[in-house]
């Protein structure tokens, strides 16, 4: 029987990707393992090779089709198995019945750009990537701004409780370099989590006009 504690966690990006992490205490680092996806109501199945990401955890991405294709729906259940090679046979190490729309993690927002910048404010827009049309407007965002001399962890979180792909940052300091990030989360799904943070967007506020009060 399998020994040690295991964890097998997967998320669906809402379109054509299931990303999985498997961790197993005491597992051999050089063992060949894979994740196998077996849908309950579709003709395809898919496999990905688990690659080490740390001493006792492995990760892989199940690519189900073209990035923007809708490969699964809210009624699908996909049985996911971790299989590891043991001599000449494959051994099942972990198994779960995966409900894709209960375990969502979208791709990080993309195409961040400064729409307009002034001395004290900056308007920024972004786009969501590979997000299902099923969500319609049922998404929320978190944003954060990195100020000089601070860390991302210290940055206060700004919450946008609707599908709003822009923000107007205010009370900024003139002639100052900032960075901005945003992430997205569907409202649907018991185990749904935030997307990764977007790539940071660097911008600089305009200098204050000479002789004017700031």
């Amino acid at each position: 029987a399998v020994n040690g504690t295991s964890q097998f966690t997967c998320f669906y990006n809402s379109r054509a990707n299931i990303s999985c992490v498997w961790s197993q205490d005491g597992a051999l680092q050089d063992t060949s393992c894979q994740v196998h996806a077996w849908p309950d109501r579709r003709r395809w199945n898919q496999t990905c090779e688990l690659l080490p990401v740390s001493q006792a955890s492995w990760a892989c991405n199940l690519i189900l089709g073209a990035p923007d294709s809708q490969k699964l729906t809210t009624v699908d259940i996909v049985t996911l198995r971790v299989l590891c090679r043991e001599g000449v046979r494959w051994r099942v190490m972990a198994i779960q019945d995966f409900k894709p729309f209960e375990n969502l993690r979208l791709m990080a927002p993309i195409s961040l750009q400064v729409v307009h910048v002034e001395t004290h404010r900056c308007n920024i827009s972004w786009e969501i990537s590979q997000a299902s049309h099923y969500f319609e407007r049922h998404l929320e965002f978190e944003a954060r701004t990195l100020s000089p001399g601070h860390t991302w962890e210290e940055a206060p979180l700004l919450t946008l409780k609707q599908k709003q792909e822009w923000i107007c940052l205010e009370t900024l300091t003139p002639d100052t370099q900032y960075e901005f990030q945003v992430r997205v989360k569907p409202l649907q799904g018991e185990f749904t989590t935030w997307s990764p943070w977007s790539q940071p967007l660097a911008f600089r506020t305009k200098p204050a006009a000479l002789g004017k009060d700031t």
Epitope: T79, V92, D97
Partner: nanobody, 125 residues
Framework: EVQLVESGGGLVQPGGSLRLSCAIS????????IGWVRQAPGKQREGVSC????????FYADSVKGRFTISKDNAKSTVYLQMTNLKPDDTAVYYC??????????????????WGLGTQVTVSS
């Protein structure tokens, strides 16, 4: 080799209750994901309930949620399926099954490594 022996089946009226037992020998209960799978005449095997190895998470088919409860007694190496408010649709042979892995599956019963011989449950007036 793990052996599974079911008991507790029988004839019961609609709305009645039964408790199925599955005694496990040849292995420790904590080492396996355990499932109850049923097969009605002329139908495919259907996962009813299962319990994940090590973290004891429990899962139920929508058709039995709120009526059936899976539990285990490590000291007795036995898994139970408490069935209440039974319906004629619950009539089937009930099998206990085990998988040598973390987790369990209701959707794909063929993933189980070890099977009992089954116990008949008949719900009829």
């Amino acid at each position: 080799e793990v052996q599974l022996v079911e008991s507790g089946g029988g004839l019961v009226q609609p709305g009645g209750s039964l408790r199925l037992s599955c005694a496990i020998s040849g292995g420790t209960l904590d080492s396996y994901g355990i499932g109850w799978v049923r097969q009605a005449p002329g139908k495919q095997r259907e996962g009813v309930s299962c319990m994940s190895r090590s973290d004891d998470r429990t899962f139920y088919a929508d058709s039995v949620k709120g009526r059936f409860t899976i539990s285990k007694d490590n000291a007795k190496s036995t898994v139970y399926l408490q069935m209440t408010n039974l319906k004629p649709d619950d009539t089937a042979v009930y099998y206990c099954a085990a998988v040598d892995a973390y987790g369990c599956s209701l959707v794909q019963p063929t993933t189980y490594d070890f099977w009992g011989l089954g116990t008949q449950v008949t719900v009829s007036s």
